[in-house]
C-alpha cells in the first residue's frame, strides 16, 4: 500500500509544491514581458522516496530498478502533476499582446 | 533559439530514452504477474541542460531559477513525455486476467 503523502525523510523534505518569488530579470523575461513585474513561481521540489506520491506504474518500476541499479537508474523525480494558468502581457513588434499560459505554474506535484 | 535535441554534454549524456532489461523479480512483480517473464523497460534518463528538450514554459523558468539559485531550485528533470501501452497477464483470485497498462513504458522523453 502506498504511504501517499507521508514523508519518511521528515516534514517538507519530500516532493511538494514550493513558491519562489522571482522578478522578470530572474526569469530572463525582462526583454519580452511587461506584466506582471514579479511572479510567485510555484514549482515541485523535493525527494521521491519509495511509494511517495507515485504518479503511475512507471514510477513504481523506476523506484524498484533504482534500488537494484542505483548507478544506472535514477530515482523518480518530483514534477508537476498539473498546472495553474497565468496571463502575461508581452511586448510585440506592433505594441503589446495578452498571452495566456496553461503550463507555467505548478499546481500540484508527484513523482515520476 | 532552442537547441532542441543537440546535447551540449556529449552524445548520449542528455535526457533520452534508455532500455533496461528487467525480470519480474527485479520489478517486484513475481507474486502477481505471470507474463511476460522479463520486460524491456524503457525509461527516461539523462541530464537536462539549458534549452534541451524543454517540455514547456515551466521547464524554462525552472532552469533560469536553477542557474540563479542552484541550492534552492533543482535543474529540470528527465521524465516521460508519453508512454507505450503494455499487456500483463496477472494472477487473480479466480485464475488469470489480461490487463493493459498505459503508463508503464516510456515512449519519449522531455525535461520538466
Amino acid at each position: 500500500a502506498r504511504n501517499g503523502d507521508r514523508c519518511p525523510l521528515g516534514p517538507g523534505r519530500c516532493c511538494r509544491l514550493h513558491t519562489v518569488h522571482a522578478s522578470l530579470e530572474d526569469l530572463g523575461w525582462a526583454d519580452w514581458v511587461l506584466s506582471p513585474r514579479e511572479v510567485q513561481v510555484t514549482m515541485c521540489i523535493g525527494a521521491c522516496p519509495s511509494q511517495f506520491r507515485e504518479a503511475n506504474m512507471h514510477a513504481q518500476i523506476k523506484m524498484n530498478l533504482h534500488r537494484l541499479k542505483p548507478d544506472t537508474v535514477p530515482a523518480p523525480c518530483c514534477v508537476p502533476a498539473s498546472y495553474n494558468p497565468m496571463v502575461l502581457i508581452q511586448k510585440t513588434d506592433t505594441g503589446v499582446s495578452l498571452q495566456t499560459y496553461d503550463d507555467l505554474l505548478a499546481k500540484d506535484c508527484h513523482c515520476v | 533559439a532552442r537547441n532542441g535535441d543537440r546535447c551540449p554534454l556529449g552524445p548520449g549524456r542528455c535526457c533520452r530514452l534508455h532500455t533496461v532489461h528487467a525480470s519480474l523479480e527485479d520489478l517486484g512483480w513475481a507474486d502477481w504477474v505471470l507474463s511476460p517473464r522479463e520486460v524491456q523497460v524503457t525509461m527516461c534518463i539523462g541530464a537536462c541542460p539549458s534549452q534541451f528538450r524543454e517540455a514547456n514554459m515551466h521547464a524554462q523558468i525552472k532552469m533560469n531559477l536553477h542557474r540563479l539559485k542552484p541550492d534552492t531550485v533543482p535543474a529540470p528533470c528527465c521524465v516521460p513525455a508519453s508512454y507505450n501501452p503494455m499487456v500483463l497477464i496477472q494472477k487473480t483470485d479466480t485464475g488469470v486476467s489480461l490487463q493493459t497498462y498505459d503508463d508503464l513504458l516510456a515512449k519519449d522523453c522531455h525535461c520538466v
Epitope: 497565468m86 502575461l88 495578452l98 | -
Partner: antibody
C-alpha cells in the same frame, strides 16, 4: 495599504472632453498596471483600456480607440483617463483598477461619476 | 470579442441557503475567468481568480469551479452581507469582458 483615489464628479456637455485622475498610494506606482472600467447607470461593467505605468504603453478596447487616452504621471503617482467627443451614452461611473496580475482587477478606485447632458 | 452570459439575472435566497451562480462564455477560455461582488454605490471586489483560486480575505463560503465555457460561483451558506450584484470577467483575450451580472437578493 494600496489605495486608489479618483477625482470628483463631472458634468459635461455633448461633444466635450473629460479627464479623470486616479492617484495611487501605498505601493510603488510602477509596480502595478492600471486599467479603466466604466459602468453606465443600472448597467454592467465595460473595460476601456490598460496602461503600463513604467513607460506609458497602453492598450485600448477597440470601442474606445481614438476617443479614450490613457496617460500616467509617475512623479505624481497618478493615472489619467481622458474621453473626448462625449455623448449621453458616456454617462457612467468610471473606475480605475490596479492590477498586480494582469488577468484580473485587485484594487479599485472609488469611482468618478461623469454625466453628459445638454 | 468574448461574450459572457450570466444566469439567473436575479437570485432570491434565504440566509443559510446555498446559492449557485452561472457564467457561460461564447468560446473556450480555459481557466481565465474571475468573479467579483459589487454592492450598491461601491466598486467591485475580487472574490475568485482563475475560475477556482481563492482570494485572501474573502470568506471561504465563496468557491468557484469550471473551465472551458461553463463556470459556477457557489456561496455555500448565504449571509445577509452577501447581497449585491456578482460579475464574471474573462482575461483569455483582449478586450477583457464582463458578464451582465447576477443580482443576489436576500429573502
Amino acid at each position: 495599504q494600496v489605495q486608489l483615489v479618483q477625482s470628483g464628479s463631472e458634468l459635461k456637455k455633448p461633444g466635450a472632453s473629460v479627464k479623470v485622475s486616479c492617484k495611487a498610494s501605498g505601493y510603488t506606482f510602477t509596480s502595478y498596471d492600471i486599467n479603466w472600467v466604466r459602468q453606465a447607470p443600472g448597467q454592467g461593467l465595460e473595460w476601456i483600456g490598460w496602461i503600463y505605468p513604467r513607460d506609458g504603453i497602453s492598450k485600448y478596447n477597440e470601442k474606445f480607440k481614438g476617443r479614450a487616452t490613457l496617460t500616467v504621471d509617475t512623479s505624481a503617482s497618478t493615472a489619467y483617463m481622458e474621453l473626448s467627443s462625449l455623448r449621453s451614452e458616456d454617462t457612467a461611473v468610471y473606475y480605475c483598477a490596479g492590477t498586480y496580475d494582469p488577468a484580473y482587477f485587485d484594487y479599485w478606485g472609488q469611482g468618478t461619476t461623469v454625466t453628459v447632458s445638454s | 470579442e468574448i461574450v459572457l452570459t450570466q444566469s439567473p439575472a436575479t437570485l432570491s435566497v434565504s440566509p443559510g441557503e446555498r446559492a449557485t451562480l452561472s457564467c457561460r462564455a461564447s468560446q473556450s477560455i480555459s481557466y481565465y475567468l474571475h468573479w467579483y461582488q459589487q454592492k450598491p454605490g461601491q466598486a467591485p471586489r475580487l472574490l475568485i481568480k482563475y475560475a477556482s483560486q481563492s482570494i485572501s480575505g474573502v470568506p471561504d463560503r465563496f468557491s468557484g469551479s469550471g473551465s472551458g465555457t461553463d463556470f459556477t460561483l457557489k456561496i455555500s451558506r448565504v449571509e445577509a452581507e452577501d447581497f449585491g450584484v456578482y460579475y464574471c470577467q474573462q482575461s483569455n483575450s483582449w478586450p477583457y469582458t464582463f458578464g451582465g451580472g447576477t443580482k443576489v437578493e436576500i429573502k
